[in-house]
Structure formats: structure tokens, C-alpha cells
């Protein structure tokens, strides 16, 4: 995130409810910190289509968070 500035969240707005699984290249989870007080789920899309924030309250986001947490712990 080249433009990332301290003290602010990476996403603006509530985020998309779902992204087609076939379009997902990578999912990153940013946990609450001094920079942002909420969890953010950032999806990198395939074919150089950029990034999108997933609504952390959505079913898909909850599944991704669970999957990542299982993998990491």
C-alpha cells in the first residue's frame, strides 16, 4: 500500500458483500490497531484488476477470517 498513511483505515465505505471466488488472487486481513480501529479484509483480484475491501460483517469475510486464523494458529 504505497499511499498508506498512519492513523487511517485502508478501506472507505462498508465494502462489498461478496467477491467471486474465481476472481480472488489473495486475501489480506488487517486487524484493529492504532492505525484503524476495525478489522479490514482486503481482496486482491486476479488479472491485475486491483483490490477491493470485503465487508467484514459479510458471510464470505467471516469464512475468510476463519480460514486464515486456522492456518495461522
Amino acid at each position: 500500500f504505497p499511499m498508506f498513511k498512519r492513523g487511517r483505515c485502508l478501506c472507505i465505505g462498508p465494502g462489498v458483500k461478496a467477491v467471486k471466488v474465481a476472481d480472488i488472487e489473495k486475501a489480506s486481513i488487517m486487524y484493529p490497531s492504532n492505525n484503524c480501529d476495525k478489522i479490514e479484509v482486503i481482496i486482491t483480484l486476479k488479472e491485475n484488476k486491483g483490490q477491493r475491501c470485503l465487508n467484514p460483517k459479510s458471510k464470505q469475510a467471516r469464512l475468510i477470517i476463519k480460514k486464515v486464523e486456522r492456518k495461522n494458529f
Epitope: 500500500f1 504505497p2 499511499m3 498508506f4 487511517r8 483505515c9 485502508l10 478501506c11 472507505i12 465505505g13 462498508p14 465494502g15 462489498v16 458483500k17 467477491v19 482486503i42 481482496i43 483480484l45 491485475n48 484488476k49 486491483g50 483490490q51 477491493r52 475491501c53 470485503l54 465487508n55
Partner: nanobody
Framework: EVQLVESGGGLVQAGGSLRLSCAAS????????IGWFRQAPGKEREGVSI????????YYADSVKGRFTISSDNAKNTVYLQMNSLKPEDTAVYYC??????????????????????WGQGTQVTVSS
């Protein structure tokens, strides 16, 4: 049917002001961030300013900070961009967009995605020196 209608563009002298309006309809305002983007001839479309109607969070490109102010009237489903101290380099077509999942860091070279973004037709802003 989703509609975003921009108004308020025009020709202004350097140092002058304009106020752009974007009237939105056909979708739930609170589910989207609403932003102003601009495209100058031969340049990429870039994010200028964005507001999240659900929580009031805002974003401004470095080039407009302190000069432009974004605001929204949720009762009217309308977003405004007050542009002061305009410079010739602000000359561009200004588009209003409603989008989901915008990542602030990608706003300087924005890639539109028709699944998540709605766009207006654009309004020309010309700043003469």
C-alpha cells in the same frame, strides 16, 4: 435503475470556485461510498475525494487537500464537492461514482470494476489562467 447525475461544472478563472453536485438514485446510499474522480486528457482517471455516507469518513487526494471539501446530504441522496482556489491543472472531466470496497491506497490510479461501481456521465471543469 441506478442513476448518478452530476451538475455544477463550467469555466472558471484560476483562483475561482465551483460547487459540483451528484444526485444519486436507485440504490441504498448507505451501502456505498460516493466519490468524485477526474480525468484530464491523456491521463488516468484519479480519485479526487470520497465520502462514506454510512459513517462520514472522507478521503482527499494530496493535490486537492485544503482546497476541496466533500459533503453529503443523506436525506437528498446527494454528494457535493466544493472546489476553491482552482488551478489550471484541475481542468478535467469530473465524474461522480458510487462504489463498494474502495481501497484508499489505489485511488490515485483507479481501476473501475463494473460489478462494484456505478458512474455518472461526467461534467467538464475548465480552469483558465
Amino acid at each position: 435503475e441506478v442513476q448518478l447525475v452530476e451538475s455544477g461544472g463550467g469555466l472558471v478563472q484560476a483562483g475561482g470556485s465551483l460547487r459540483l453536485s451528484c444526485a444519486a438514485s436507485g440504490f441504498n446510499f448507505d451501502d456505498y461510498a460516493i466519490g468524485w474522480f477526474r480525468q484530464a486528457p491523456g491521463k488516468e482517471r484519479e480519485g479526487v475525494s470520497i465520502i462514506s455516507s454510512s459513517d462520514g469518513n472522507t478521503y482527499y487526494a494530496d493535490s486537492v487537500k485544503g482546497r476541496f471539501t466533500i459533503s453529503s446530504d443523506n436525506a437528498k441522496n446527494t454528494v457535493y464537492l466544493q472546489m476553491n482556489s482552482l488551478k489550471p491543472e484541475d481542468t478535467a472531466v469530473y465524474y461522480c461514482a458510487a462504489g463498494q470496497g474502495w481501497v484508499i491506497a489505489t485511488m490515485t490510479s483507479f481501476r473501475a470494476h463494473r460489478e462494484y461501481d456505478y458512474w455518472g456521465q461526467g461534467t467538464q471543469v475548465t480552469v483558465s489562467s
